[in-house]
């Protein structure tokens, strides 16, 4: 028995950031799971991992240097990515594994989401000074 995953076919990352929602045919509430986002047709690059342990705080990390965060819904995980580069335009696949309670479950491969990273507009208006941070 496999979990089905739905993703948007395409997203555009403006300002080098994007939110990708992975919707599952499975309720993740009170489950131990590992949700991950993979880059490339062969899913060779694991972009981000969101580890959930029942109703506790999500643990988020990337072994490949991506700046990411995750939000959990009952039947979804949304990945938030920052500081994307134009050359990271690619197809991204959601993956889900449920470790507990048994039985172990994972997903049928989804259709993926093409994330198109638009370059930052680097020409400031001459009327306004550069931004200032507190």
């Amino acid at each position: 028995n496999k979990i089905l995953v739905k993703q948007s076919p395409m997203l555009v990352a403006y300002d080098n950031a994007v939110n990708l929602s992975c919707k599952y045919s499975y309720n993740l509430f009170s489950r131990e799971f590992r949700a991950s986002l993979h880059k490339g047709l062969d899913s060779a690059v694991e972009v981000c991992v969101v580890y959930g342990n029942y109703s506790q705080q999500l643990q988020v990390y990337s072994k490949t240097g991506f700046n990411c965060d995750g939000k959990l819904g009952n039947e979804s995980v949304t990945f938030y990515l920052q500081n994307l580069y134009v050359n990271q335009t690619d197809i991204y696949f959601c993956k889900i594994e449920v470790m507990y309670p048994p039985p172990y479950l994972d997903n049928e491969k989804s259709n993926g989401t093409i994330i198109h990273v638009k370059g930052k507009h680097l020409c400031p208006s001459p009327l306004f000074p550069g931004p200032s941070k507190p």
Partner: antibody, heavy 120, light 107 residues
Framework: EVQLVESGGGLVQPGGSLRLSCAAF????????MHWVRQAPGKGLVWVSR????????SFADSVRGRFTISRDNAKNTLYLQLNSLRAEDTAVYYC?????????????WGQGTLVTVSS | EIVLTQSPATLSLSPGERATLSCRAS??????LAWYQQKPGQAPRLLIY???NRATGIPARFSGSGSGTDFTLTISSLEPEDFAVYYC?????????FGQGTKVEIK
């Protein structure tokens, strides 16, 4: 004026535990990601952990993952770092830092730090 | 993770002189680089973000430049309060990392 005040540091034996606190003043705490950064005596800065604005997600440096936990109480405007299974190499000044509102890992305000010494 | 290498380790200068500090990244960080100042016994303070933007309240004598792998922090004319340790930090890749610091000391 933004102010971050750490407390809870001290001397602890290897294998012991400690809980650090960071009280926040002068800004809407619940709107910001928060971080812990440490500095061993005479050494440079090393990022330790972060928590998002509502406390629902966290990340940790490899060196502390599984030993440290981060949490926050937005009602009390306070950030916490629970340090377990402490090692000599965890000896450092621990700073809490606020992330810039638009950049998760840009640290725009820092506390004065609290010293953790792990020694037998 | 990205390694940031700062040079020189120590810079001995007199007040009024120009200070040039370097930070080199092990791979491109685009313009996602910040500079912090730390005085003895004090917390770090954000000076420059996104390679060249001054943080609020930072004097104009501090300027940053560079992109990709090579970055520079310049203090055009050193004031007595500028003698401190300076750190660069990247936020391009996770985890965020800092350089080992450059100490600017009075000659």
């Amino acid at each position: 004026e933004v102010q971050l005040v750490e407390s809870g540091g001290g001397l602890v034996q290897p294998g012991g535990s400690l809980r650090l606190s960071c009280a926040a003043f002068g800004f809407t705490f619940s709107n910001y990601w928060m971080h812990w950064v440490r500095q061993a005596p005479g050494k440079g800065l090393v990022w330790v952990s972060r928590i998002n604005s509502d406390g629902s997600s966290a990340s940790f440096a490899d060196s502390v993952r599984g030993r440290f936990t981060i949490s926050r109480d937005n009602a009390k405007n306070t950030l916490y770092l629970q340090l377990n299974s402490l090692r000599a190499e965890d000896t450092a000044v621990y700073y809490c830092a606020r992330a810039d509102s638009s950049s998760w890992y840009l640290f725009d305000n820092w506390g004065q730090g609290t010293l953790v010494t792990v020694s037998s | 993770e990205i390694v940031l290498t700062q040079s020189p380790a120590t810079l001995s200068l007199s007040p009024g002189e120009r200070a040039t500090l370097s930070c080199r990244a092990s791979q491109s960080v685009s313009s996602y680089l910040a500079w912090y100042q730390q005085k003895p016994g004090q917390a770090p303070r954000l000076l420059i973000y996104d390679a060249s933007n001054r943080a609020t309240g930072i004097p104009a004598r501090f300027s940053g430049s560079g992109s990709g792998t090579d970055f520079t922090l310049t203090i055009s004319s050193l004031e007595p309060e500028d003698f401190a340790v300076y750190y660069c930090q990247q936020r391009s890749n996770w985890p965020p990392t800092f350089g080992q610091g450059t100490k600017v000391e009075i000659k």
